[in-house]
C-alpha cells in the first residue's frame, strides 16, 4: 500500500517570496508523484517546479497559486493511486494604484459646496488600512469640522470648499507591507474671491528704442487689485514711475506699455493680482533687449573641381536667435540644387571652376544684420606656359631653366637635381614663377633637372638635361712664382681644359725659344739640369679652335736649397748657468734663421735681457730656469724653401759635490759649463 510520510499543509505565503509544499511517500513498488491544482495536473516552470516529491515555489503568485493543491502518488505497475490532503496558500500581498474621483462623475462637475469623494485604489490581502494626505500632510477623520471622513478606502469631503484644494494622495499597509498611490489627484476648487489668471504676460524681445507691451489680467469677485513691479521691487503706476521707467504706462485693462526701450529697462517685470481673499498671484515676464554680435571671419577656402564641399556659417550670438542665409553675387541661395543652402551650411556639390568667387553669409534679427564673406577658390591642375628644355650653359656664367605654369591658386614649383630637391643657396635660386637660376655654372652642374608644379588639384612635371660648356681654363692655374734647385732636374707642369682638348706650349716671356736642355713635353716644362740662366719669366699658352687661347705667366727662380752647416744638439744646463744652442744654415738666396721655443716663435725684438740670437743664428739663454726646459726648433728659410731642425734643452739643479769626487771629475752627461 502507498503511505504518505509527509503531507502538504495549508500555509501563509508572501507574494513574490519562496514557498514549499512538502510531500513524502513510502510504497513497496516504484511510484511516481505528481501534483494537482484544483484537480488539474501542475506543469513544472522556472517559477513553480517539483523538487523530489515536494512542490517548490521560487516566487509565489497570488493569481496563479490560488486554489487547492494535492499530492498524488501512483504505482504504474499495479495502477494503485493515493492522494494527499488538500493544501492551499493564504497569500499576503499589497499593490499600489491611483487616487481617482468617485463622486461627482467628472472634475468639471466639482463646484464649491458640493460633496466630493475620492477612492484609493490600493488593494491587498489582508485588507489594508488606509491613510490619506493633502499636499503631503496626513488627514484624520473629523478634521476641519467633520468635513473630511475617511471610510476604508474612500475619502469624502462634505461640503468641499476652496480650502480643500490641494494634491491628494494615499498610502495603505497590511501584514505584507506598505504601498502608496501611484498617481495622485489634484483637487482645485475655485474661490470667487481669489484672484485667478485670465491673461499672463509673456517674455518679450525688443530692439533698442522700440516699444514693449506686457498684457496681464486677473478675475475675482469682487474684482481684484493689479500691480506692476520692476526688478528692484519698485511699483509702476501712472502717478509714480521710477526714474528709469519714465516712459511706462499702465492701462486700465492691466497692460503695461514701455516706449523707447533702453538697456536699463531690460529685466524681470512682475504682475501681481490680489483678490479679497487668498494669496497674491504673481506672474513674471522678462524684457530682453535684442542684440546681435559680430560674425567670425572665414578663412579663404580652396576646393578642387568635381568634389563636394561644405562651408558652415556659425551664426553670431544674438537675441532672438538670428536667422542665417547665404548669398552669392547678391542672390540668395536656394535650398536645393547643385549649389544650395542646407541649414547653416553652404553646400557645393560637384564643384565647377565657375563656382569660384565670394559667398556671403548673412545673419539677422531684431537688433540688425551682420554679414561675412568667404572667398572660394576652385583649384585647377597647372598647365604649361614654358617647359624646361635641354640646355647648354656656359661655365662660370649664370644659367636659367624655366618651368612656367599657370593654375589657380598660384602653383608651388620645386626643382630636383639628380633626384635631389634643390635648396636655395648662393648658387641656386628659384623664382616664384618657377624659373631656376644657377648663379655660377660649374662643370658638375651638367646633369638632369626636373621641376614639379602643383596645386591642391594636381601636379605636372617635366625634366631637362643641362650640358655645361666648359671655359678654356688652366687646371690648376700654374703658381706665378716657382723655385728650381740649382744643378738638379726640375719640372714645371701646366694643364688646361676646355670644350675641346687644348694644345699647351711653353715659351719664354721675351719670346725667345727654349734652350735645347729644356723640353716642353705635353705642357710639362722639363729642365734636365738647372743652370743659373734658366731663371726668368716663362709663359704657358693653352689654345683650342673654338675658344682661342689663354696664357699663364710664371717667374722661375734658381736657388741653392737650404742645408744646415751646424745643427743644435741635445743640451743639459745647470740652473742659473747659460745655455748655447748653435744653428747655421746655407743656401741661395741666403737663408734667414728663426727660433721656435716651446711652440711659439721667439721674436728677436721681444726676447728680453736673458735671450739673444746671434748673427750666425745661434741662440743664447742666460741664467736658465727650469721653465726654459723644452724643445727648441731652428727654422731656416728663404724665398724658395724652408727647413727646420730641433733639439731639447734640459735645465737641472747643480749637484752638491761629494768628498769622493775630485774637482776634475766629468759630469755623467754633456754639460755646458760657464
Amino acid at each position: 500500500a502507498i503511505v504518505f510520510i509527509k503531507q502538504p499543509s495549508s500555509q501563509d505565503a508572501l507574494q513574490g517570496r519562496r514557498a514549499l509544499l512538502r510531500c513524502e511517500v513510502e510504497a513497496p513498488g516504484l511510484v511516481h508523484v505528481y501534483w494537482l491544482l484544483d484537480g488539474a495536473p501542475v506543469q513544472d516552470t522556472e517559477r513553480r517546479f517539483t523538487q523530489g516529491s515536494s512542490l517548490s515555489f521560487a516566487a509565489v503568485d497570488r493569481l496563479q497559486d490560488s486554489g487547492t493543491f494535492q499530492c498524488v502518488a501512483r504505482d504504474d505497475v499495479t495502477g494503485e493511486e493515493a492522494r494527499s490532503a488538500n493544501a492551499s496558500f493564504n497569500i499576503k500581498w499589497i499593490e499600489a494604484g491611483p487616487v481617482v474621483l468617485k463622486h461627482p462623475a467628472s472634475e468639471a462637475e466639482i463646484q464649491p459646496q458640493t460633496q466630493v469623494t475620492l477612492r484609493c485604489h490600493i488593494d491587498g490581502h489582508p485588507r489594508p488600512t488606509y491613510q490619506w494626505f493633502r499636499d503631503g500632510t496626513p488627514l484624520s477623520d473629523g478634521q476641519s469640522n467633520n468635513t473630511v471622513s475617511s471610510k476604508e478606502r474612500n475619502l469624502t469631503l462634505r461640503p468641499a470648499g476652496p480650502e480643500h484644494s490641494g494634491l491628494y494622495s494615499c498610502c495603505a499597509h497590511n501584514a505584507f507591507g506598505q504601498a502608496c498611490s501611484s498617481q495622485n489627484f489634484t483637487l482645485s476648487i475655485a474661490d470667487e474671491s481669489f484672484a485667478r489668471v485670465v491673461l499672463a504676460p509673456q517674455d518679450v524681445i525688443v530692439a533698442r528704442n522700440e516699444e514693449a507691451m506686457f498684457h496681464c489680467q486677473f478675475s475675482a469677485q469682487p474684482p481684484p487689485n493689479l500691480q506692476w513691479l520692476f526688478e528692484d521691487e519698485t511699483p509702476i503706476t501712472n502717478r509714480s514711475r521710477p526714474p528709469h521707467l519714465r516712459r511706462a504706462t499702465v492701462f486700465a485693462n492691466g497692460s503695461l506699455l514701455l516706449t523707447q526701450v533702453r538697456p536699463r529697462n531690460a529685466g524681470v517685470y512682475r504682475c501681481i493680482g490680489q483678490g479679497q481673499r487668498g494669496p497674491p498671484v504673481i506672474l513674471e515676464a522678462t524684457l530682453h533687449l535684442a542684440e546681435i554680435e559680430d560674425m567670425p571671419l572665414f578663412e579663404p577656402r580652396v576646393f578642387t573641381a568635381g568634389s563636394e564641399e561644405r562651408v558652415t556659417c556659425l551664426p553670431p550670438k544674438g537675441l532672438p536667435e538670428p536667422s542665417v542665409w547665404w548669398e552669392h553675387a547678391g542672390v540668395r541661395l536656394p535650398t536645393h540644387g547643385r549649389v544650395y543652402q542646407k541649414g547653416h551650411e553652404l553646400v557645393l556639390a560637384s564643384i565647377a571652376e565657375s563656382d569660384a568667387g565670394v559667398y556671403t553669409c548673412h545673419a539677422a534679427n531684431l537688433a540688425g544684420q551682420r554679414r561675412q564673406d568667404v572667398n572660394i577658390t576652385v583649384a585647377t591642375v597647372p598647365t604649361w606656359l614654358k617647359k624646361p628644355q635641354d640646355s647648354q650653359l656656359e661655365e662660370g656664367k649664370p644659367g636659367y631653366l624655366h618651368c612656367l605654369t599657370q593654375a589657380t591658386p598660384k602653383p608651388t614649383v620645386v626643382w630636383y637635381r639628380n633626384q635631389m630637391l634643390i635648396s636655395e643657396d648662393s648658387r641656386f635660386e628659384v623664382f616664384k614663377n618657377g624659373t631656376l637660376r644657377i648663379n655660377n655654372v660649374e662643370v658638375y652642374d651638367g646633369t638632369w633637372y626636373r621641376c614639379v608644379s602643383s596645386t591642391p588639384a594636381g601636379s605636372i612635371e617635366a625634366q631637362a638635361r643641362v650640358q655645361v660648356l666648359e671655359k678654356l681654363k688652366f687646371t690648376p692655374p700654374p703658381q706665378p712664382q716657382q723655385c728650381m734647385e740649382f744643378d738638379k732636374e726640375a719640372t714645371v707642369p701646366c694643364s688646361a681644359t676646355g670644350r675641346e682638348k687644348p694644345t699647351i706650349k711653353w715659351e719664354r716671356a721675351d719670346g725667345s725659344s727654349l734652350p735645347e736642355w729644356v723640353t716642353d713635353n705635353a705642357g710639362t716644362l722639363h729642365f734636365a739640369r738647372v743652370t743659373r740662366d734658366d731663371a726668368g719669366n716663362y709663359t704657358c699658352i693653352a689654345s683650342n679652335g673654338p675658344q682661342g687661347q689663354i696664357r699663364a705667366h710664371v717667374q722661375l727662380t734658381v736657388a741653392v736649397f737650404i742645408t744646415f752647416k751646424v745643427e743644435p744638439e741635445r743640451t743639459t744646463v745647470y740652473q742659473g748657468h747659460t745655455a748655447l744652442l748653435q744653428c747655421e744654415a746655407q743656401g741661395d738666396p741666403k737663408p734667414l734663421i728663426q727660433w721656435k721655443g716651446k711652440d711659439r716663435i721667439l721674436d728677436p725684438t721681444k726676447l728680453g735681457p736673458r735671450m739673444h740670437i746671434f748673427q750666425n743664428g745661434s741662440l743664447v739663454i742666460h741664467d736658465v730656469a727650469p721653465e726654459d726646459s723644452g724643445r727648441y726648433t731652428c727654422i731656416a728659410g728663404n724665398s724658395c724653401n724652408i727647413k727646420h731642425t730641433e733639439a731639447p734643452l734640459y735645465v737641472v739643479d747643480k749637484p752638491v759635490p761629494e768628498e769622493s769626487e775630485g774637482p776634475g771629475s766629468p759630469p755623467p752627461y754633456k754639460m755646458i759649463q760657464t
Epitope: E299, V302, P411, V414, L421, E424, F431, K432, V452, P456
Partner: antibody, heavy 118, light 111 residues
Framework: QVQLQQSGAELVKPGASVKLSCTAS????????IHWVKLRTEQGLEWIGR????????KYAPKFQGKATITADTSSNTAYLQLSSLTSEDTAVYYC???????????WGQGTLVTVSA | DIVLTQSPASLAVSLGQRATISCRAS??????????MNWFQQKPGQPPKLLIY???NQGSGVPARFSGSGSGTDFRLNIHPMEEDDTAMYFC?????????FGGGTKLEIK
C-alpha cells in the same frame, strides 16, 4: 649677397598703428613672395601673411585679418607690414622672410621689435 | 588650419649625444611626393635659420649632424653629435597650405 633689411625698433601707444618696412638687396622682390612672421617669447613663431609684390595679391592667417595689412613698393624694392589698433598682445619681434615657389624661408630679415606701451 | 604639436617643450642633452625633437601635424602635410615640413633653429636676438626643408633636405651651409625624417603627420629632427653651439630654440613649420603654421618650439640645452 641676398639681404632683407628691416626698419628700426618702434615704441607705440595702445590704439595706434605702426608700419614696418623690409627692403631687399641683391634680388628683385617681384621675383619672390615676401612673408611676415611674429615672434613672442612665450607663444613662439606665428605666420602673419604674405604678399606677391608683382600683383599685390595677399594672403593672411585668420588671426591677423583686420589687424595686419601687407603691401609692397616694387620701385623701392620694399615690403611693408602695417599693424593697427595696437594692444600689448602686439608687442613682439616681427620678421620678414623671402620664399620662392618652393615654399620655405631661406632668407630672413634681422627683425623689428615693436613695443606697445602707454 | 593645420596644427603642429612639438615635443618635448624643452630638452637637455649631453655633448656628443643625440637630440631628437618630434613634430606631429593634425593632418597630413604630404603633397605629390613631398612632405612640406621644415625645421628652423633660432638663437636669442637672431632670426630663425632654415635647417631642414621638405622633411629631410639640409638647408644651405647646415652641418651634417642635423637630419630630418618622417612623412604624413609625424616628423623628427635629429642632432648628433650634440655640440655647444646647438643650444637654441627649434621650430617645425608646415608649408603645405595657407595659413602656414609653426610648432610651439623646443628649447634645447646642454646637460
Amino acid at each position: 649677397q641676398v639681404q632683407l633689411q628691416q626698419s628700426g625698433a618702434e615704441l607705440v601707444k595702445p590704439g595706434a598703428s605702426v608700419k614696418l618696412s623690409c627692403t631687399a638687396s641683391d634680388f628683385n622682390i617681384k621675383d619672390f613672395y615676401i612673408h611676415w612672421v611674429k615672434l613672442r617669447t612665450e607663444q613662439g613663431l606665428e605666420w602673419i601673411g604674405r604678399i606677391d609684390p608683382e600683383d599685390g595679391e595677399t594672403k593672411y592667417a585668420p588671426k591677423f585679418q583686420g589687424k595686419a595689412t601687407i603691401t609692397a613698393d616694387t620701385s623701392s624694392n620694399t615690403a611693408y607690414l602695417q599693424l593697427s589698433s595696437l594692444t600689448s598682445e602686439d608687442t613682439a619681434v616681427y620678421y620678414c622672410a623671402r620664399a620662392s615657389s618652393g615654399p620655405w624661408f631661406a632668407y630672413w630679415g634681422q627683425g623689428t621689435l615693436v613695443t606697445v606701451s602707454a | 588650419d593645420i596644427v603642429l604639436t612639438q615635443s618635448p617643450a624643452s630638452l637637455a642633452v649631453s655633448l656628443g649625444q643625440r637630440a631628437t625633437i618630434s613634430c606631429r601635424a593634425s593632418e597630413s602635410v604630404d603633397n605629390y611626393g613631398i612632405s612640406f615640413m621644415n625645421w628652423f633653429q633660432q638663437k636669442p636676438g637672431q632670426p630663425p635659420k632654415l635647417l631642414i626643408y621638405a622633411a629631410s633636405n639640409q638647408g644651405s651651409g647646415v652641418p651634417a649632424r642635423f637630419s630630418g625624417s618622417g612623412s604624413g603627420t609625424d616628423f623628427r629632427l635629429n642632432i648628433h653629435p650634440m655640440e655647444e653651439d646647438d643650444t637654441a630654440m627649434y621650430f617645425c613649420q608646415q608649408s603645405k597650405e595657407i595659413p602656414w603654421t609653426f610648432g610651439g618650439g623646443t628649447k634645447l640645452e646642454i646637460k
